[in-house]
Interface confidence: medium
């Protein structure tokens, strides 16, 4: 995250780290005992599930046991829209046990359209700056706002590739964005309760004024969430 | 049309074993976790049991635990449930239900009645 | 286990009326609550699930609000065959549980 401060895990209790051969490759966030909700790119590389870890409760990197994943499920890849369908969900092989920093986020609901400038949190273990530099050993939050898609998508921006299925998230003068590591973590809305209305995916560069950070917007994909748990118990 | 049809209930002894099924028609059977629901006379609803579109993960209720067994023949779009060591509190319509949307039960039988008394 | 708590266990109302029932509980559910009408002699049927959307199919007088702990299920200008018995339950974790249930009468 770029432009951040510290953050605890008391704050953010579903945030979780995705580890490949224990390095931590995207962040996620629990859904519920059994589920994790993560971007889809995450795992272009590995789709098996033996060498994947999830790390909870913890808001450093290296802290806190890892739990064994049970499935991976990715929905199908869109080739005319490569960018769209970046969303994924982790299944893990026991259940969480909740507590003060082990806890799930809400989906959002089906209509929950939020308005240019609706505050939003952003938190990740990536990169604080958009050219390189590390990880970051604990967890950072911001504070940003929804971009207008019109904005998003104009000539200085991203040229009409942020389809309805994404939203767009920063501030107006840039600054504050996701980064390289931070993909696959949850973009918060606080209603009556934590809703996560998108999952961090792509964007040019990190914290730039006209291209700010894009999400997957979940709403668009709660039909495919609840097709994959009809299946499943 | 989409449904599920139960049949096996009836009378029994307790301590006896009863085998209920459930067939299913009208939609693609093994997209979906089935259930097992229960509503004993006057009483309220209960899960009983549960079974993931592959049998891969299966959940009893407390209540029957360790005496009833959920199964599924996906070929034959049909769910079992082997009910042993049976109970007069274990008397009940008994109904199949399939899990959909947000894990509901969108698709209900019509019910089975099991009656445990001497 | 997650317990699941309905108030009020029974309502008698007119026709037209406004009418809600709670359920809460016993820990956090994010938002995996679903409300089911019963009529005597027939099996449930399912009215809302993820504690806001609609099932195909059901009147929209029928609503749902509600996260975490406490949902609700309202039903606005409440017409004769609304008559049964209402459960809410949760599909949150296993093993699923059900409300006692809101028995409800038309006057």
């Known amino acids: 995250v770029v432009g951040v401060e510290e953050a605890s895990v008391d704050s953010w209790p579903w945030q979780v780290s995705i580890q490949y051969d224990k390095q931590h490759v995207c962040g996620g966030s629990i859904l519920d005992p059994h589920w994790v909700l993560t971007a889809a790119h995450c795992f272009r590389k590995h789709t098996d599930v033996f060498n994947w870890k999830v790390r909870a409760g913890s808001d450093k990197l290296g802290s806190f046991p890892s739990l064994a994943v049970a499935k991976i499920i990715i929905i199908e890849f869109n080739p005319m829209y490569p960018k769209d369908n970046d969303i994924a969900l982790m299944k893990l092989q026991f259940p969480l046990t909740f507590s003060g920093t082990v806890r799930p986020i809400c989906l959002p609901f089906f209509d929950e359209e939020l308005t240019p400038a609706t505050p939003l949190w952003i938190i990740g273990w990536g990169f604080t700056k958009q050219n390189g530099g590390k990880m970051s050993d604990i967890l950072l939050q911001a504070s940003v706002q929804v971009i207008d898609s019109t904005r998003c998508n104009a000539d200085d921006a991203y040229q009409g590739e942020v389809t309805e299925k994404m939203m767009c998230a920063g501030i107006p003068e840039g600054g504050v964005d996701t980064c390289q590591g931070d993909s696959g973590g949850p973009l918060m809305y606080q209603s009556d309760q934590w809703h996560v209305v998108g999952i961090v995916s792509w964007g040019y560069g990190c914290g730039g004024p006209s291209t700010p950070g894009v999400y997957t917007k979940v709403s668009a994909y709660l039909n495919w969430i609840y097709n994959v748990w009809k299946a499943e118990l | 049309q989409m449904q599920l049809v139960e049949s096996g209930g009836g009378l029994v002894q307790p301590g006896r074993s009863l085998r209920l099924s459930c067939a299913a028609s009208?939609?693609?059977?093994?997209?979906?976790?089935i259930h097992w629901v229960r509503q004993a006379p006057g009483k309220g609803l209960e899960w009983v049991s549960g079974i993931s579109w592959n049998s891969e993960i299966v959940g009893y209720g407390d209540s029957v635990k360790g005496r009833f067994t959920i199964s599924r023949d996906n070929a034959k779009n049909s769910l079992d449930l082997q009910m042993n060591s049976l109970r007069a509190e274990d008397t009940a319509v008994y109904y199949c239900?399939?899990?959909?949307?947000?894990?509901?039960?969108?698709?209900w039988g019509q019910g089975t009645m099991v009656t445990v008394s001497s | 286990d997650i317990q699941m708590t309905q108030s009020p266990s029974s309502v008698s109302a007119s026709v037209g009326d406004r009418i809600t029932i709670t359920c809460r509980a016993s820990?956090?559910?994010?938002?995996?609550l679903n409300w089911y009408q019963q009529k005597p002699g027939k099996a449930p049927k399912l009215l809302i699930y993820g504690a806001t959307s609609l099932q195909s199919g059901v009147p929209s007088r029928f609503s749902g609000s509600g996260s975490g702990t406490d949902f609700t299920l309202t039903i606005r200008g409440l017409q004769p065959d609304d008559f049964g018995t209402y459960y809410c339950q949760q599909s949150y974790n296993l093993p699923r549980t059900f409300g006692q249930g809101t028995k409800l009468d038309i006057k």
């Open positions: 820990q956090s559910i994010s938002t995996y």
């Open positions: 009208g939609f693609t059977f093994d997209d979906y976790a």
């Open positions: 239900a399939r899990g959909s949307s947000g894990r509901a039960f969108d698709i």
